[in-house]
């Protein structure tokens, strides 16, 4: 089948990194600089993506594969193929329309991107707070007070909703 196809269409013999040049008797010509063909049998090479402006090159374009971009330092990618760059914030912050803002009490963000999320409410699982939450870290839930033998607990049982370690009600 391959042989039949190549007899019918000489372009099918052109490998990735080349194109079937109609101006030169359909011979396989290498892709020109700043272009690529990722599959065989192509009649043109595609132009390489430029990683300029807020984008920077993560992977250079080659004759067989397109360039890949990421974002300049202090920014991270959004969208398919890194189609937008968004400013990083510090851990314990989230990006709002007014810039980076600290997480509100009862929420945390342990990354440089994304939004602040509520602390885990340990009491919903019948557990107690082992380690209090911060702006950068979620609470750590421990065994439920009932699981601990009397006198052995160093953990205070869940109390009013405003106590650190609980999501605001």
């Amino acid at each position: 089948f391959e042989r039949t196809r190549s007899l019918q269409d000489p372009c099918s013999n052109c490998p990735a990194g080349t194109f079937c040049d109609n101006n030169r008797n359909q011979i396989c010509s290498p892709c020109p600089p700043n272009s690529f063909s990722s599959a065989g049998g192509q009649r043109t090479c595609d132009i390489c993506r430029q990683c300029k402006g807020v984008f920077r090159t993560r992977k250079e374009c080659s004759s067989t594969s397109n360039a890949e971009c990421d974002c300049t330092p202090g920014f991270h990618c959004l969208g398919a193929g890194c189609s937008m760059c968004e400013q990083d914030c510090k851990q314990g912050q989230e990006l709002t329309k007014k810039g980076c803002k600290d997480c509100c009490f009862g929420t945390f963000n342990d990354q440089k991107r994304g939004i602040c999320r509520p602390w885990t409410n340990c009491s919903l699982d019948g557990k107690s707070v082992l380690v209090n939450g911060t702006k950068e870290r979620d609470v750590v839930c421990g065994p439920s007070p009932a699981d601990l033998s009397p006198g052995a607990s160093s953990v205070t049982p869940p109390a009013p909703a405003r106590e650190p370690g609980h999501s605001p009600q």
């Epitope: 993506r49 984008f55 397109n66 398919a80 193929g81 189609s83 760059c85 968004e86 400013q87 810039g99």
Partner: antibody, heavy 115, light 107 residues
Framework: QVQLQQWGAGLLKPSETLSLTCAVY????????WSWIRQPPGKGLEWIGE???????DSNPSLKGRVTFSVDTSKNQFSLKLNSVTAADTAVYYC?????????WGQGTLVTVSS | EIVMTQSPATLSVSPGERATLSCRAS??????LAWYQQKPGQAPRLLIY???TRATGIPARFSGSGSGTEFTLTISSLQSEDFAVYYC?????????FGGGTKVEIK
């Protein structure tokens, strides 16, 4: 909220220099690329060029040689100068933030070139 | 430079109907394409980036699709505030270029 506010002379004579400034309020200034785009009356949009806080620039080859960008990081402002203007440069000029696409825009300034 | 071509130049649609706008690139631009809405006397507003991702605060009735050279912006049910001019823009390669725009008007 990120806001871009722009100003500059609205009426020029041929051969004069167009000068516009854009101030950025809210959000971060450094790290972003800041662009200028223009729109002739009743027509489409044309990218003029861009500058980053460090002063690095890029511009449309169709305007190269006539366009200059500058930045004042102490005021969170960037500026455009276009020299030797003609009637073909009559347009609404916009400043915008470049994050890949243009996600925030200034209100636009109509610049008319007429003798 | 990459030339962006939009069609139709004008689209007449009744409120509540679906609007489909097309944008074609002269060369493949993967999905590195944005759509903007512009109302008279206003600056353009970003609707879609990466060909299909809605920008912050953009209603779900706006959707983008396509890859390579053919792209579509669909407004599923036109509201009165959607009558405007829409532009596509590639940022795959410099210089950055825009399409000529599609005016969506009330039928």
């Amino acid at each position: 909220q990120v806001q871009l506010q722009q100003w500059g002379a609205g009426l020029l004579k041929p051969s004069e220099t167009l000068s516009l400034t854009c101030a950025v309020y809210g959000g971060s200034f450094s790290g972003y690329y800041w662009s200028w785009i223009r729109q002739p009356p009743g027509k489409g949009l044309e990218w003029i060029g861009e500058i980053i806080h460090s002063g690095s620039t890029d511009s449309n080859p169709s305007l190269k040689g006539r366009v200059t960008f500058s930045v004042d990081t102490s005021k969170n402002q960037f500026s455009l100068k276009l020299n030797s203007v003609t009637a073909a440069d009559t347009a609404v000029y916009y400043c915008a933030r470049l994050t890949g696409p243009f996600d925030y825009w200034g209100q636009g300034t109509l610049v008319t070139v007429s003798s | 430079e990459i030339v962006m071509t939009q069609s139709p130049a004008t689209l007449s649609v009744s409120p509540g109907e679906r609007a489909t706008l097309s944008c074609r690139a002269s060369q493949s631009i993967s999905s590195i394409l944005a759509w903007y809405q512009q109302k008279p006397g206003q600056a353009p507003r970003l609707l879609i980036y990466g060909a299909s991702t809605r920008a912050t605060g953009i209603p779900a009735r706006f959707s983008g699709s396509g890859s390579g050279t053919e792209f579509t912006l669909t407004i599923s049910s036109l509201q009165s505030e959607d009558f405007a001019v829409y532009y596509c823009q590639q940022y795959y390669n410099w210089p950055l270029t825009f399409g000529g725009g599609t005016k969506v008007e009330i039928k």
